[in-house]
């Protein structure tokens, strides 16, 4: 039997025996195309593919709708996996989604949604979401039904203001929405009464920014 | 389409009452904060007092602390401002203005208005 | 209570010329987030107020470009590049940095 050499996502490596977290070049669904992205082997049963990473601030993350589509940072440290993949991935099979988040004082908790895919580029990547559980929050920091994806360059919002550009970051912003992940990165003691913050509301509250956040998907039939 | 209409102003005689309301719709009403704002007869816009989307916190101008008192009711889409031991100098057209963000910290900017109501204080 | 001072008044305006209004604070409005808190507003006559600018420089959506915001800290400019007959109206500054927020006096742009 062969060996697979080209993977579409860290859950397929995970099974081919590599159980090692750590970056994995990637292959996007019927194409050539690779990516890099690290995969978490460890949480969960592992096989992880993580689409969104913060934890230092040593990424800017108001980026534009053509990096938000491509990438960026390192999959090391901060990054963004990119739409067009995630996009792509996921509208191949059903993929969960797990949101890990961590504030300043040393908590943790985490949303799961048993059902996450973006739509394609033509639909602004808008984020469609079911299925939540998890320890930050019973209402989904997320708006549903989902927003389209909204950047610096691309204002796709429903408000009368431009969300990107007011909150910082890419995001599925709505008007402008509970959550935004790829917010401004506070540090310690500066990270309170900030509306442009990495905001999580229905954990956190208005104003607070978080630590650290980890966004990743897998297989729902894993 | 967000709207915002104010009702309950009229002629009241100093040292009464007076309750104002303003329906909401076109928004998740629970998501935002909101406002009162005043505006004496040709003069101009004065904050009177605001209240949190899920209405655990107000806020008050000093020349109303104590007399008015904001609420809502998300269930019924609607703002309230009760106002009591009225003055003359409490006349004016009131609006009801709505928070620029949701799920935020902001006192304002306000990104809708609504008509106003008018409150005459005479005896 | 942050006091907010217009300038000026009154200002008559020719279709098609520029105009500036001026807006000081007793105090910075420059919150640690790195935004100004300041907005304008403009009140057209019989009308409520509408938002025109948010935090110091950004435009709201259907504003039209010849409005711009500029300014940081204690001082604020709203200009209007090419006046036109539709943008007659009282003028307001209003600061959003403490509670209470307050607002400037209000300029009255009207024709010439």
């Known amino acids: 039997k062969e060996e697979q050499t080209t993977f579409r996502d860290c859950a397929e490596i995970f099974k081919s025996g590599l159980t090692t977290s750590g970056i994995y070049t990637l292959t996007f669904p019927n194409s050539t195309e690779e990516i890099k992205a690290y995969c978490d082997m460890d949480v969960g049963g592992g096989g992880w593919t993580v689409i969104q990473h913060r934890e230092d601030g040593s990424v800017d993350f108001q980026r534009t709708w053509k990096e938000y589509k491509e990438g960026f940072g390192s999959p090391l440290g901060e990054y963004w996996l990119g739409n067009e993949f995630v996009s792509q991935l996921t509208g191949q099979h059903r993929y969960v989604l797990k949101i890990q988040l961590k504030d300043w004082e040393g908590n943790e908790a985490h949303s799961l949604y048993d059902h996450f895919y973006l739509a394609g580029e033509e639909s602004n990547y808008r984020i469609h979401l079911t299925g939540l559980t998890g320890t930050a929050g019973k209402i989904s920091s997320i708006s549903q039904p989902g927003s389209d994806f909204s950047t610096k360059d691309s204002d796709n919002d429903k408000c009368i203001c431009k969300c990107s550009q007011m909150l910082s970051g890419g995001w599925w912003f709505d008007a402008c929405g509970p959550s935004n992940l790829n917010g401004q990165y506070y540090p310690q003691k500066q990270n309170t009464n900030k509306f442009n913050g990495i905001k999580w509301y229905y954990w956190k509250g208005s104003g607070y920014s978080l630590k650290a956040t980890t966004m990743m998907i897998r297989p729902a039939d894993f | 389409e967000v709207q915002l209409v104010e009702s309950g102003g009229g002629v009241v005689q100093p040292g009464r009452s007076l309750r104002l309301s303003c329906a909401a719709s076109?928004?998740?009403?629970?998501?935002?904060?909101m406002h009162w704002v005043r505006q004496a007869p040709g003069k101009g816009l004065e904050w009177v007092s605001a209240?949190?989307?899920?209405?655990?916190?107000?806020y008050y101008a000093d020349s109303v602390k104590g007399r008015f008192t904001i609420s809502r009711d998300n269930a019924k889409n609607s703002l309230y401002l009760q106002m009591n031991s009225l003055r003359a100098e409490d006349t004016a057209v009131y609006y009801c203005?709505?928070?620029?963000?949701?799920?935020?910290?902001?006192?304002?900017?306000?990104?809708?208005w609504g008509q106003g109501t008018l409150v005459t204080v005479s005896s | 209570d942050i006091v907010m001072t217009q300038s000026p008044l009154s200002l008559p305006v020719t279709p098609g010329e520029p105009a500036s209004i001026s807006c000081r604070s007793s105090?910075?409005?420059?919150?640690?987030?790195?935004?100004?808190?300041l907005d304008w507003y403009l009140q057209k006559p019989g009308q409520s107020p509408q938002l025109l600018i948010y935090?110091?420089?950004n435009r709201a959506s259907g504003v039209p470009d010849r409005f711009s915001g500029s300014g940081s800290g204690t001082d604020f400019t709203l200009k209007i590049s090419r006046v036109e007959a539709e943008d007659v109206g009282v003028y307001y500054c209003?600061?959003?940095?403490?509670?209470?927020?307050?607002f400037g006096g209000g300029t009255k742009v009207e024709i010439k």
């Open positions: 203005a709505r928070d620029l963000l949701d799920y935020d910290i902001l006192t304002g900017p306000y990104a809708y």
């Open positions: 076109g928004f998740t009403f629970s998501s935002y904060g």
């Open positions: 209240i949190s989307g899920s209405g655990g916190s107000t």
């Open positions: 105090q910075s409005l420059l919150h640690s987030n790195g935004y100004n808190y």
């Open positions: 935090l110091g420089s």
């Open positions: 209003m600061q959003a940095l403490q509670t209470p927020p307050t």
